[in-house]
């Protein structure tokens, strides 16, 4: 067992070295380790094959370090890995698209608060078992087409607190099992009418605190399972173009937030849902 760590075998073989001031991944981690806790240290780099000997590893926590670089092959050999937490590493900024390849059993991936500016092509390729993906509180500006295409079992996708300005047509392709999509506190001004086409199982959608002045109801039509919708804190324009959204909200049987109008001035602060159809005039 490495000097700064505690190692124990029941109920799972665990190597636990949190908050020890470590500046590198310690050598001598027992090969039988099923869980490795390295969070809260000063580790800045995860070299290739850092954990290759740990074939039985199911949980790896590296959150709250100062990671600036993760070699593309850092997690090779970890075919049984189920949880990987890399959050709270603000200097990371980018992740090589090959980093997570081969992690076919991964069900939870934390990449929140990592200063990520983009999601490279194929970053999540092959992660068929992934259920929870935490990408909130980064600096993401765009959602490239087909980024999540392989994530057919993903149920929770957290993208809030980024700088995303639009939701393109193919952003969420393949997310047939998605239950919860959090997109609040971004800069979304435009949602493509077909952006949510694959989200037939979505129950919760948060779009509050964005830059939306309108939302095509065509985008909401596929959301047959939707129960919770939050649209507040957007600059909604409540003129005749808002009529389709108004009509959709009247029929919506789930729970929705207020939709306060910004314009026209005479309706500023009023809730779109509570307006009458003939209030929505002038274009």
């Amino acid at each position: 067992c490495p000097g700064a760590c505690v190692c124990y075998n029941e109920p799972k073989v665990t190597t636990s070295c949190p908050q020890q001031g470590l500046q590198a991944v310690p050598v001598g981690i027992p090969a039988a380790s099923q869980r490795i806790f390295l969070h809260g240290n000063r580790i800045s780099h995860v070299p290739a094959a850092s954990f290759r000997a740990c074939r039985n590893l199911t949980i790896l926590w590296l959150h709250s370090n100062v990671l600036a670089r993760i070699d593309a092959a850092a997690f090779t050999g970890l075919a049984l890995l189920e949880q990987l937490d890399l959050s709270d590493n603000a200097q990371l900024r980018s992740v090589d698209p090959a980093t997570f390849h081969g992690l076919g059993r991964l069900h939870t991936l934390h990449l929140d608060r990592c200063g990520l500016q983009e999601l490279g092509p194929g970053l999540f390729r092959g992660l068929a078992a992934l259920q929870y993906l935490y990408l909130q509180d980064n600096a993401l500006q765009a959602l490239p087409d087909d980024t999540f295409r392989d994530l057919g079992n993903l149920t929770h996708l957290f993208l809030h607190g980024n700088r995303i300005s639009s939701v393109p047509e193919r952003a969420f392709r393949g997310l047939h099992s998605l239950d919860r999509l959090l997109l609040h506190q971004n800069r979304v001004a435009h949602v493509h009418p077909h952006a949510f086409r694959d989200l037939g199982r979505l129950m919760t959608l948060y779009l509050f605190a964005n830059n939306l002045s309108a939302l095509p109801t065509e985008a909401l039509a596929p959301l047959r399972a939707l129960q919770y919708l939050r649209l507040n804190d957007n600059p909604w324009v409540c003129d005749c173009r808002a009529r389709p959204l108004w009509a959709w909200l009247q029929k919506f049987r789930g729970s929705s937030s207020e939709v306060p109008c910004s314009l026209p001035q005479r309706l500023a602060g009023r809730d779109l849902k509570r307006l009458a159809a003939n209030d929505l005039q002038g274009c």
């Epitope: 505690v6 190692c7 124990y8 029941e10 109920p11 799972k12 665990t14 636990s16 949190p18 908050q19 869980r35 806790f37 929870y132 929770h156 957290f158 239950d179 919860r180 959090l182 919760t204």
Partner: antibody
């Protein structure tokens, strides 16, 4: 400052269920977790489980697995704890508490509800 | 209970008292320790978090420390209003849950 207000005392029959609510005011649910702790008369504190409302995920103590369900309604900032198949040993004060941050594992419970007395008696 | 505390402790006003909390490698050995104070008939209150940090409003007479698989709470300049039950707590990796200590009843003589 966040305040947690719980529902009132309950008297239940063995075998039945109880659902206790915990309404948060002064803050939104989006930046913290809610946990439930119970205390039988004259006994110590016992953790039952917790929920991170914004993530929609709950954790339960092994002892209560299958018997407790913790949920949250973000639209009303209210968390719920339902305990089923009640027995006399479940007679206790049930507390909800706020967890600093979004990791139950690093949990410190910095604000507590006033407690709800649940009595299980035939 | 996975964390063991002495059932009782006592001291006179102005004295310093220490309450111990003994655990194992899967809880205190691997995770941070918190301490809670429960005055008679009230809900618990967070006293110390992350081994040795005090929330705002908690007097600096209260301090916490951790070494290996044990932790302790020290109260200096004991006051009559410190009479309460004190609980240590930590996450347990083996149980995948939060565990409390057995509790210590502090009496100010």
């Amino acid at each position: 400052e966040v305040q947690l207000v719980q529902s009132g005392a309950e008297v239940k029959k063995p075998g039945s269920s109880v659902k206790v609510s915990c309404k948060a005011s002064g803050d939104t649910f989006s930046s913290y977790a809610i946990t439930w702790v119970r205390q039988a008369p004259g006994q110590g504190l016992e953790w039952m489980g917790g929920i991170i409302p914004i993530y929609g995920t709950a954790n339960y103590a092994q002892k209560f697995q299958g018997r407790v369900t913790i949920t949250a309604d973000e639209s009303t900032n209210t968390a719920y704890m339902k305990l089923s198949s009640l027995r006399s040993e479940d007679t206790a004060v049930y507390y909800c508490a706020r967890v600093v941050g979004l990791r139950l594992r690093d949990a410190a419970f910095d604000a507590w509800g006033q407690g709800t007395m649940v009595t299980v008696s035939s | 209970y996975v964390l063991t505390q002495p059932p009782s402790a006592s001291g006179t006003p102005g004295q310093r008292v220490t309450i111990s909390c003994s655990g194992s490698s899967s809880n205190i050995g691997s995770n941070t320790v918190n301490w809670y104070q429960q005055l008679p008939g009230t809900a618990p209150k967070l006293l110390i978090y992350s081994n040795n940090q005090r929330p705002s409003g908690v007097p600096d007479r209260f301090s916490g420390s951790k070494s290996g698989t044990s932790a302790s709470l020290a109260i200096s300049g004991l006051q009559s209003e410190d009479e309460a039950d004190y609980y240590c707590a930590a996450w347990d990796d083996s149980l995948n849950g939060y565990v409390f200590g057995t509790g210590t009843k502090l009496t100010v003589l």
